[in-house]
């Protein structure tokens, strides 16, 4: 079996976390957080190809079945395994609060 | 907001649970397992339209994000929730054994 | 690199007024909040309240609310602290630190100001 | 508001041992603790962050852990420029709260 880890495709071309620079303007939480006003937005990007992070036996499956029927099944797709909690000041009624959020940035990648 | 389970691009287009029928061979099972020589996969399938589904706050800043950069971000990916067990009849080095696996057929379908 | 740069050291009468000033440099001001943070002679940190540099709103020590004010001047990235009705027990080094970011870390401060308070 | 306590208030060691220090949040704060250093007569240095992750360009002999409630800061073999006050902080929700303070001093 191909290493689990191993980009067929060539380094950086398969599922694995990426930071995304974004404003709460491009995130669409102006009216709402306060600060930080930037973000660094880790998020899972990359193909799947066979053997490659496979999350679990329902990824094998979905990658045998999208070989043999590609336009019915498709590929298993690169998403978050586990996220890493972010802490956002928020206004409130009464003023600004801190809020932790538990499933905002993604920690490490998997394909499902 | 919309209605996170109408579908925008029309019936059946958006992120729900599929079946799929398959035979042991299609799943590449076919060396190690006995029964059943068939299987309904359940698997999840379809796009993930803006607010359709969205598993928790990653989804929503992967969706705005991916319409602000469409060719760096993609958009969420339609995947199990949750899944059911299964059990298959398996070979083994002294006869044979029935074995759960509890990662195999998709019971719930969400965006993420 | 980022840093923050605070005015010099006051001495002041009971029942007078301080302001000191934080000027920020080597990042986009606006993005991250400001913290203010005093420590007296020999003892310990204490959080006085924290502005967010891009709309001004705040949140204050409940023990300080209104004796203290804290603004911005975003035209020349600069953070203030206006402490008023002065008390000995004011007396402190008074610190301006950077945060909280993402991961809730307040991660630059200023080199700290000691505002002595004595008739 | 989270009471932060820290302990011991002072610990006497030589350069080269393990240093443990410990502070219990009043209630849960999730990951959200930070450690400082202060030296005399100089601001608070940020160490670690988020309970366990090292800030930029603090050397690897000091280490975070815990969650919830209990935390831990570990200097694995203390250097002659360890000795300093430390510090832990929540910021897990307003008012952001700080421990007592630990001091290291030379045995």
């Known amino acids: 079996a191909r290493n689990g880890d191993r980009c067929p495709l060539g380094p950086g071309r398969c599922c694995r976390l990426h930071t995304v620079h974004a404003s709460l303007e491009d995130l669409g939480w102006a009216d709402w957080v306060l600060s930080p006003r930037e973000v660094q937005v880790t998020m899972c990007i990359g193909a799947c190809p066979s053997q490659f992070r496979e999350a679990n036996m329902h990824a094998q499956i979905k990658m045998n079945l999208h070989r043999l029927k590609p336009d019915t099944v498709p590929a298993p797709c690169c998403v978050p395994a586990s996220y890493n909690p972010m802490v956002l000041i928020q206004k409130t009624d009464t003023g600004v609060s801190l809020q932790t959020y538990d499933d905002l940035l993604a920690k490490d990648c998997h394909c499902v | 907001a919309r209605n996170g389970d109408r579908c925008p691009l029309g019936p059946g287009r958006c992120c729900r649970l599929h079946t799929v029928h398959a035979s042991l061979e299609d799943l590449g099972w076919a060396d190690w397992v006995l029964s059943p020589r068939e299987v309904q996969v359940t698997m999840c399938i379809g796009a993930c339209p803006s607010q359709f589904r969205e598993a928790n706050m990653h989804a929503q800043i992967k969706m705005n994000l991916h319409r602000l950069k469409p060719d760096t971000v993609p958009a969420p990916c339609c995947v199990p929730a949750s899944y059911n067990p299964m059990v298959l009849i398996q070979k083994t080095d002294t006869g044979v054994s029935l074995q759960t696996y509890d990662d195999l057929l998709a019971k719930d379908c969400h965006c993420v | 690199q980022v840093q923050l740069v605070q005015s010099g050291a006051e001495v002041k009468k009971p029942g007078a007024s301080v302001k000191v000033s934080c000027k920020a440099s080597?990042?986009?001001?606006?993005?991250?909040?400001i913290n203010w943070v005093r420590q007296a002679p020999g003892q310990g940190l204490e959080w006085m309240g924290w502005?967010?540099?891009?709309?001004?709103?705040?949140n204050y020590a409940q023990k300080l609310q209104g004796r203290v004010t804290m603004t911005t001047d975003t035209s020349t990235s600069t953070a203030y602290m206006e402490l008023r009705s002065l008390r000995s027990d004011d007396t402190a080094v008074y610190y301006c630190?950077?945060?909280?970011?993402?991961?809730?870390?307040?991660?630059?401060w200023g080199q700290g100001t000691m505002v002595t308070v004595s008739s | 508001d989270i009471q932060m306590t820290q302990s011991p208030s002072s610990v006497s060691a030589s350069v080269g041992d393990r240093v443990t220090i410990t502070c219990r949040a009043s209630?849960?704060?999730?990951?959200?603790l930070a450690w400082y250093q202060q030296k005399p007569g100089k601001a608070p240095k940020l160490l670690i962050y988020?309970?366990?992750s090292l800030q930029s360009g603090v050397p690897s002999r000091f280490s975070g852990s815990g969650s919830g409630t209990d935390f831990t800061l570990t200097i694995s073999s203390l250097q002659p420029e360890d000795f300093a006050t430390y510090y832990c902080?929540?910021?897990?929700?307003?008012?952001?709260?700080f421990g007592g303070g630990t001091k290291v001093e030379i045995k």
């Open positions: 209630q849960g704060i999730s990951s959200w």
């Open positions: 902080q929540q910021a897990n929700s307003f008012p952001i709260t």
């Open positions: 502005i967010d540099a891009y709309s001004g709103s705040t």
């Open positions: 988020a309970a366990s």
């Open positions: 630190a950077r945060g909280p970011g993402q991961y809730a870390d307040v991660d630059v």
């Open positions: 080597g990042y986009t001001f606006t993005s991250y909040g």
